[in-house]
Interface confidence: low
């Protein structure tokens, strides 16, 4: 409508007792420059006088005189574009409607702006993303519908009452579209932050507390598990029983499935929180863990290394090297699967025990023809003595000896 003055400013401005209010404002008059400006508080039109009644907070006429009691109200505008205002300090009874009565040479206009002044500093508002997942970076936003050049404030983030170490980015807006102070904090929540309290605290320039907003974090995370084993050292002997228990220390949302894994492979038909292994065999040695899933995904416990101890199995002998040339060196290695490892070995040459040879390896530095034959061994650990295996044959090569002509 070309018959109207055009104004742009925030519809409502918010402040509290003792703070200030900065009103960004632009206008375009219908004709010529502004000649008179009056700022009313709660103006009412009087039909009898054809004028507005109400408290005059500020008055500027062609003479440019401003009464001294209006010092807290400042018109920071000009005669054709800017109508920005400042009230410092602002009081509770300033709440209501501000009326900007503008007059040019031939035209008049009343522009209304709402002012909401609270008794105490009002709290900021924390905005969280719709869903927060562990280890995924999110931005926490704290928004306060207030900003004023004459009243510096700060927004501080706290986690469980302790300042958060992450750097927050604070921005302010004092435009004709919006007036606010905003703090944004990038944060990678861990599962242990679930249920914790985050606070955005409004403080004055000296760090004095003014107000706050709090939220409780709802951090979605995979199940967190603890595995317990009986016996606690997870060392058993063949034929013993083992019980493993899986405990869920935290899950959000609730868990849905349970399974057990051995060496990374799922154990069939083991879908409860207790794994009972009866009369274990050595093949059941390995790394066990429990896996519990929820809508976020699977969670795994730490691995328990189950050691099933058993007496040595029948041993085999490895010879380095056979056939051997007379005068060369040879090493024999006794190999036997056992848990714990064998502590003692007995060596045999052609069925006869080799005295003083109790190690896993036997080293002969200089081979003679009589060293040829079958070598076998027996391994021994705390659980018993193994059986003697088939042994290995040492072939000794040597040059002709005591040559006789026939």
């Amino acid at each position: 409508d070309s018959s109207k003055w055009v104004f742009e400013h925030p519809e409502t401005l918010y402040a509290w007792e003792g703070a200030c209010v900065w009103i960004p404002c632009t206008y375009r008059a219908l004709d010529g420059d502004l000649e008179s400006f009056i700022l009313f508080h709660n103006p009412e039109y009087n039909k009898n006088t054809s004028k507005f009644d109400g408290t005059r907070l500020y008055e500027s006429t062609k003479d440019g005189k401003v009464p001294s009691e209006q010092k807290r109200v400042q018109f920071l505008g000009d005669k054709n574009k800017n109508c920005t205002l400042s009230i410092h300090p602002v009081h509770l009874n300033d709440s209501g409607q501000l009326g900007l009565r503008m007059e040019s040479k031939t035209e008049k206009w009343m522009e209304r702006i709402h002012l909401n002044v609270s008794e105490r500093p009002f709290p900021p508002h924390i905005q969280l993303p719709p869903e927060i997942q562990e280890s995924q970076e999110v931005t926490l936003t704290c928004l306060l519908n207030f900003s004023c050049y004459g009243y510096p404030i700060q927004l501080q983030w706290l986690l469980e009452g302790v300042p958060m170490r992450q750097a927050a980015v604070t921005s302010t807006s004092l435009t004709i579209k919006s007036v606010f102070t905003r703090s944004e904090l990038k944060f990678s929540p861990q599962w242990s932050h679930h249920g914790k309290i985050v606070t955005c605290q409004l403080q004055d320039a000296d760090g004095k507390f003014l107000s706050n907003d709090t939220v409780q974090l709802n951090v979605k995370h995979t199940p967190k598990l603890e595995i317990k084993v009986t016996p606690s050292d997870a060392i058993v002997r063949e034929g013993d029983s083992v019980t493993m228990t899986c405990e869920v220390s935290s899950s959000n949302p609730e868990y849905t499935t349970v399974s057990w894994l051995k060496d990374g492979t799922s154990l069939k038909k083991q879908n409860t929180f207790t794994l009972n292994l009866r009369e274990v065999t050595k093949d059941q040695s390995g790394k066990y863990c429990c896996q519990v899933s929820n809508d976020v995904g699977p969670g795994r416990s730490e691995e328990v290394f189950l050691q099933v101890q058993y007496a040595p199995e029948p041993s085999t002998v490895q010879i380095l090297h056979s056939p051997a040339v007379e005068g060369s060196q040879v090493e024999f290695l006794c190999m036997s699967l056992a848990n714990p490892l064998p502590t003692n070995y007995t060596w045999y040459h052609n069925g006869k025990e080799m005295q003083g040879r109790t190690e896993e390896k036997v080293h002969i530095p200089k081979i003679l023809p009589w060293h040829a034959g079958t070598y076998s061994c027996v391994a021994e650990n705390i659980l018993g003595t193994g059986q003697r295996g088939p042994g290995a044959e040492l072939d000794v090569q040597y040059p002709p000896k005591k040559v006789t002509t026939v």
């Epitope: 469980e160 302790v162 861990q190 242990s192 249920g195 914790k196 309290i197 967190k224 603890e226 220390s249």
Partner: nanobody, 124 residues
Framework: QVQLVESGGGLVQPGGSLRLSCAAS???????MGWFRQAPGKEREFVAG????????YYADSVKGRFTISGDNAKNTTYLQMNSLKPEDTAVYYC??????????????????WGQGTQVTVSS
């Protein structure tokens, strides 16, 4: 360096009461504090714990209804009010602080800092 200092131990008759205090030096953040005890010739065992975020408390079955753990997170202080004391409560009582969440509050290995201990003797 964080230090935990216990106080309030002493000799008390069966049925009597004692209040133990544990103060953490310096300004640092912990998420939970707990009390453990060790009787002569026995392993150290969990007594009570408190989580600051919601003031949730945890107790060993043997002390439930008799002992109360409380505290002031702002001051990094925890208290153990022990009522209806029995001779079997005789032990050195240790205060512990959990700085990072590690799971169960009744497991010794989940606590980062320990006090030197205060002796509690219940005897007639």
């Amino acid at each position: 360096q964080v230090q935990l200092v216990e106080s309030g131990g002493g000799l008390v008759q069966p049925g009597g009461s004692l209040r133990l205090s544990c103060a953490a030096s310096g300004s640092w953040f912990n998420i939970a504090m707990g009390w453990f005890r060790q009787a002569p010739g026995k392993e150290r065992e969990f007594v009570a714990g408190i989580r600051w975020s919601d003031s949730k408390t945890y107790y060993a079955d043997s002390v439930k209804g008799r002992f109360t753990i409380s505290g002031d997170n702002a001051k990094n202080t925890t208290y153990l009010q022990m009522n209806s004391l029995k001779p079997e409560d005789t032990a050195v009582y240790y205060c512990a602080a959990q700085r990072y969440y590690r799971g169960s509050y009744n497991r010794q290995t989940n606590y980062d800092h320990w006090g030197q201990g205060t002796q509690v003797t219940v005897s007639s």
